[in-house]
Structures are given as structure tokens and as C-alpha cells.
């Protein structure tokens, strides 16, 4: 999915409160240098003691329409022998991001800002042990 300029019948930025209606240039500038990008790990999802998988979350009425989301592979963590450690838990690390969602009941190319919670990876934490008093 993509954003394209609003038609003439849609409200323009000048006619409304600036914060309610703004024009956004969606050309993405990759600010990461080649060196920084090449160091970005793509194998941590397998090497981690709390490994995860990635799924391609698609929503044509959202910008960006494609977001890769992490899910922990196991409830427990993986020890040095490759076995699940029942004293340690895999937990999802989530990040709140801003996305643009199309407002279908209005002009077809009118979008609103929405918050979205996205899983970015998993980490290993010790299980909570409750001692009987």
C-alpha cells in the first residue's frame, strides 16, 4: 500500500489545524551507513538463547504496509547443550512505533497516525520463583 496526494475534494493542510492535517513526504532516506548496516545482525534470531522467528505482517491500509515482527520460538530458553532450561523464560522485546492507517470512511488517501506495538526480538530472563511463607 502507498500514500499518494489527496484529491482536490479532500481537505488540505491550509484549511485545518496544522496538527490535524499535515503533508508528509514519504521518501525514505536510508541514513544508516553501509558499514553500520553490514554490522546489523540477522543471525541473532538463531544464535540467541531465546531464539525467535520473524513473520511478515502485511496491512495494505497501513504505511508502512510491511512490518517484520518477531515471535519467541519457545516459552523457555535454550541452554549450552541446546536443551530447554525450565528455570529461564524467553520473553518478547516489544517496541512502540508510529504508523499511518488509512481512514476508509473518509477520503481514500486520508491517513491517521496510530501507535503499534511490534515484537523486535526475544531475550532470556530468570523465572519468577514464589516461595511459600
Amino acid at each position: 500500500a502507498v500514500l499518494i496526494p489527496q484529491s482536490s475534494v479532500c481537505p488540505n493542510a491550509e484549511a485545518n489545524n496544522f496538527l490535524q492535517n499535515v503533508k508528509v513526504n514519504l521518501k525514505v532516506i536510508n541514513s544508516l551507513s553501509s558499514k553500520a548496516s553490514s554490522r546489523r545482525p540477522s543471525d541473532y534470531l538463531n544464535r540467541s538463547t531465546s531464539p525467535w522467528t520473524l513473520s511478515r505482517n502485511e496491512d495494505p491500509d497501513r504505511y508502512p504496509s510491511v512490518i517484520w515482527e518477531a515471535q519467541c520460538r519457545h516459552q523457555r530458553c535454550v541452554n549450552a547443550e541446546g536443551k530447554l532450561d525450565h528455570h529461564m523464560n524467553s520473553v518478547l522485546i516489544q517496541q512502540e512505533i508510529l504508523v499511518l492507517k488509512r481512514e476508509p470512511e473518509k477520503c481514500p488517501f486520508t491517513f491517521r497516525v496510530e501507535k503499534m506495538l511490534v515484537g523486535v526480538g526475544c531475550t532470556c530472563v530468570s523465572s519468577i520463583v514464589r516461595h511459600a511463607s
Epitope: 502507498v2 499518494i4 536510508n30 544508516l32 546489523r40 513473520s55
Partner: antibody, heavy 119, light 107 residues
């Protein structure tokens, strides 16, 4: 200049596997998705799946989920598509193509790799 | 899966004339449609993205229109190098699908 260069033609027997490579140059390899598409002789194009070299994520067309494996090697900026349990109907030209995830379109394509499955 | 249906399968037009190629989606795909040109032995070449945006370096005689389920590729004045197969494709939702192609031949 962006270039996607694929490996050479392959001839395989039914039941075998084939691994096609696609080497990228002219841009940051980890920034964009790689999709794989095939075209049987005289036919249309069929989407196989996608890999994002930046995070290692993959997604597949259900028709290929059990037989196709997509991988990427960041050190050589190369994407791979492996297809197993080959049958005669897998004879096709296999293309890698770069997908601009934010913009939402395929811009550059490899030159294609002809895979022939014959006994 | 979304089915993309192109018509006609073959179109015979004389050089200098206008060619109009059609593509229909089995359900709404908004404007998430691309058009590709393919010549024998070559890879597909992107012409139009998002239904109506001409890709960098594509001549102005190529134009696209449509939204929802009906899309059109128009070549205003056919040049000898335009005779090829043209595919439409949707990237609205995966699995991304392509039309079967329209072969544009010299009349």
C-alpha cells in the same frame, strides 16, 4: 549501479535439489527485501517467497512452503533460493528481484536462471 | 489468492498507433499494481508502479490508470521496440500475483 547477478543454468533429475544464487551490488544489501519469482516456459510469473537480509525473516507462497528455502549471506551480499524434491513441472526460469518495502514495488531483477528438470 | 486477469491475450497494433491493455483483479487491490515489459530471453522491466506512476527512465508514451479492480496500461504511439509481452502484478497482499500477460505484436 544496482546489479543482481544470478548463477548459471542447471540441469537436475527429478527428486534432486537445486540452489540458485543472486549476488547484489551497487546498494546496501541489508536494506531491501529479496523476492524470488519463477516463469515456466511460455507461462506467466509465479511468486515463490521473500527474504529480508537485514533481519533474516522469510515468508513463502503456500505452494512452495514445504520445498523452497530462502537464505542470505551478508558477507558476500548474496541471496539463495533452494528448491528440493524437484519435478518436471519445476522446469522454469527463476528470477530474484529487489522489493522496495516502503515504496512497495519491484525495481531491479536478476537476469534469470534456467532450471531444467529431466530424467 | 488474488487472481489478476489480463486481456486481450494477444493484441495486434500498427507502429504509431495507440495500444490499450487491460488487467482485472479478483478483489480490490487499491492502487497496488505494477506493469512490466518482457522481451524474449530478458527479465521483466518495471514500467509503471502504484497503478499510474511511471518508473525512472520509462518513456512518457507509457501511462497507467485505474484503482480497485480495473487497471489499464496505455502506450500512446507504439514504437518498434515496444512489441513485447506485458504483465500486470499486484503487491497488495501476498502471495503477490501476476497476470498471464498480453502479447503485443506488430499488425
Amino acid at each position: 549501479e544496482v546489479q543482481l547477478v544470478q548463477s548459471g543454468a542447471e540441469v537436475k533429475k527429478p527428486g534432486a535439489s537445486v540452489k540458485v544464487s543472486c549476488k547484489a551490488s551497487g546498494y546496501t544489501f541489508t536494506d531491501y527485501e529479496f523476492h524470488w519469482v519463477r516463469q515456466a516456459p511460455g507461462q506467466g510469473l509465479e511468486w515463490i517467497g521473500v527474504i529480508h537480509p537485514g533481519n533474516g525473516g522469510t515468508a513463502y507462497n503456500q505452494n512452495f512452503r514445504d520445498r523452497a528455502t530462502l537464505t542470505a549471506d551478508k558477507s558476500t551480499s548474496t541471496a539463495y533460493m533452494e528448491l528440493s524434491s524437484l519435478r518436471s513441472e519445476d522446469t522454469a526460469v527463476y528470477y530474484c528481484t529487489r522489493f522496495l518495502t516502503y515504496e512497495g514495488y519491484f525495481d531491479y531483477w536478476g537476469q534469470g536462471t534456467l532450471v531444467t528438470v529431466s530424467s | 489468492n488474488i487472481v489478476m486477469t489480463q486481456s486481450p491475450a494477444t493484441l495486434s497494433v500498427s507502429p504509431g498507433e495507440r495500444a490499450t491493455l487491460s488487467c482485472k483483479a479478483s478483489q480490490s487491490v487499491s492502487i497496488d499494481v505494477g506493469w512490466f515489459q518482457q522481451k524474449p530471453g530478458q527479465s521483466p522491466r518495471l514500467l509503471i508502479y502504484h497503478a499510474s506512476n511511471r518508473y525512472t527512465g520509462v518513456p512518457a508514451r507509457f501511462s497507467g490508470s485505474g484503482s480497485g479492480t480495473d487497471f489499464t496500461l496505455t502506450i500512446s504511439s507504439l514504437q518498434p521496440e515496444d512489441f513485447a509481452v506485458y504483465f500486470c502484478q499486484q503487491d497488495y497482499s501476498s502471495p503477490y500475483t501476476f497476470g498471464q500477460g498480453t502479447k503485443l505484436e506488430i499488425k
